[in-house]
């Protein structure tokens, strides 16, 4: 902490500009103003601080706002937002998309920070659901933030908010979230017809029943392997070898090259050696 | 609730064939959703996975044993069973039988009984 | 084959302590990763399978988390009787492997 000094004459600053970048951290402390700093918030990226400077500039609004900031603060943080400590940001309250976004852009490209994961978890309790625009934002900065959420909290998302979901997005989710997010899905896409449902529930399907697989063995298909190998064991393992023809048409060829991994070795385990035979790929049960 | 039970000798002499048996009570051998594994540690070391079987009869063994090792399951006895050929003092081990259910894992395991190989 | 790499192969703690030991799979196993605690001249007991779902009966201070490569098994306070030797084990591929061990010593 900076010790308490009086600010030189002359020294006293009368707005935020680059002048400031030579004075030492007491005279930061002496003589910028925390209320004029509040109000110039949007310059303070412009200007080349030190670290040490911007320790400076935050004990002086932590001074100013004890309660934790405003929002037209907060909203001009830029990258004093990288001092900010979880416990700094579960004081703020932000209602703000735009103000969301600044502080998402500043932490661009490095993995999600404590206090990135704070930011967000505040502002979408703040909000009381994962609205399509926050999730169209949070994905776009983070494509894995979906599969970072507990299951608890995906049961927040709106089956609204799913046609925001791209299939990259879903890449880490294990069976328990996807087994909340595939009836969301569903009720999402209920009206798409067939061939088209079936692209944009594909990535979903790790938390389908067997009667949807069943269903889907049906429609011509043709499930790539990749999605097979996604789907949870429960579900696949009721399904009949005739059903997985069905429902993999050409790609069912890749059963061989999986048959040592599951669902793939589990489901092959408990079919009769007759009806594997049937797939001509050489698969021992 | 299902428990296992394995029983066979404690000691073996070198390059013959130590045999085990495990017995399972409180359950069937027959479970759909199970499969029945030999895993053994060595003293002071690790864990490592022998194979496993169906009560089909179907089999998949560590690739580094399979040469030496069968595993077969009698039904009717509720019970399935371990046979290493080719002992030497490496075998000398703790050999657990563990079931596998497919949507956990080894969720069951037997006390272990220790196998010793030694002339 | 899979093989599992575990670290470290033994830390000491104190009751109390947040304890994370983790589990690197030389190729993807998805999300397949169950964790073992064995203590001394007993059978290891399952904790968490699926890498992340907790066993029934174990206690929710056992916690697990990771996809693909990199696993996690965290112990937010470590209790009296948790310290023992944790195995990770990949059930995805056919080998069946398990990790090398993490022995949880008393500081």
């Known amino acids: 902490e900076v010790e308490k000094t009086a600010c030189p004459s002359g020294k006293k600053a009368r707005e935020i500009d680059e002048s400031l970048i030579f004075y030492k951290k007491w005279e930061l402390e002496a003589c910028v103003d925390a209320a004029l700093l509040a109000t110039q918030m949007d310059r303070v990226n412009a200007i080349p601080f030190t670290y040490e400077q911007l320790d400076v500039l935050k004990h002086k609004l932590d001074e100013l706002y004890p309660q934790g900031y405003p929002e037209s603060v907060i909203q001009h943080l830029g990258y004093l937002f990288l001092k900010m400590s979880p416990e700094d940001i579960r004081k703020w309250n932000v209602t703000s998309l735009e103000t969301l976004k600044a502080l998402l852009e500043v932490n661009k490209g490095h993995e999600m920070s404590p206090q990135v994961a704070t930011l967000i978890d505040r502002f979408v309790k703040g909000r009381g659901q994962l609205d399509k625009d926050t999730l169209d934002t949070l994905t776009a900065f983070y494509p894995g933030y979906l599969c970072s959420l507990s299951p608890e909290e995906l049961s927040s998302v709106p089956p609204s908010s799913i046609w925001a979901v791209r299939p990259q997005d879903l890449d880490t989710c294990d069976p328990r979230q996807l087994d909340v997010l595939y009836p969301k899905a569903r009720l999402a896409f209920q009206n798409m017809n067939g061939s088209e449902y079936f692209v944009k529930i594909q990535s979903f399907l790790g938390g389908a029943p067997t009667e949807d697989l069943k269903a889907l063995s049906q429609q011509n298909v043709s499930m790539d392997l990749a999605t097979f190998m996604k789907l949870r064991t429960d579900a696949v393992l009721p399904l009949t070898v005739a059903e997985v023809q069905k429902l993999l048409g050409p790609h069912v060829e890749g059963l061989k090259a999986e048959e040592r991994h599951r669902p793939v070795r589990d489901w092959i385990l408990r079919q009769r050696q007759d009806d594997l035979d049937t797939l001509g790929l050489g698969l021992q049960g | 609730q299902v428990q296992l039970q394995e029983s066979g000798p404690g000691l073996v002499k070198p390059s013959e064939t130590l045999s085990l048996t495990c017995t399972v009570s409180g359950g069937s051998v027959s479970s759909y959703y199970s499969t029945w594994s030999w895993i053994r540690q060595p003293p002071g070391k690790g864990l490592e996975w022998i194979g496993y079987i169906y009560y089909s009869g179907s089999t998949n063994y560590n690739p580094s044993l399979k040469s030496r090792v069968t595993i077969s399951v009698d039904t009717s006895k509720n019970q399935f069973s371990l046979k290493l050929s080719s002992v030497t003092a490496a075998d000398t081990a703790v050999y657990y039988c563990?079931?596998?259910?497919?949507?956990?894992?080894?969720?069951?395991w037997g006390q272990g009984t220790m196998v010793t190989v030694s002339s | 084959d899979i093989q599992m790499t575990q670290s470290p192969s033994s830390l000491s703690a104190s009751v109390g302590d947040r304890v994370t030991i983790t589990c690197r799979a030389s190729q993807s196993s998805r999300y397949y990763v169950n964790w073992y605690q064995q203590k001394p001249g007993k059978a290891p007991k399952l904790l968490i399978y699926a890498a992340s779902s907790l066993q029934s009966g174990v206690p929710s201070r056992f916690s697990g988390s990771g996809s693909g490569t990199d696993f996690t098994l965290t112990i937010s306070s470590l209790q009296p009787e948790d310290f023992a030797t944790y195995y990770c084990q990949q059930p995805y591929d056919a080998s069946y492997t398990f990790g090398g061990g993490t022995k949880v010593e008393i500081k």
């Open positions: 563990a079931r596998d259910n497919v949507f956990t894992g080894f969720d069951i």
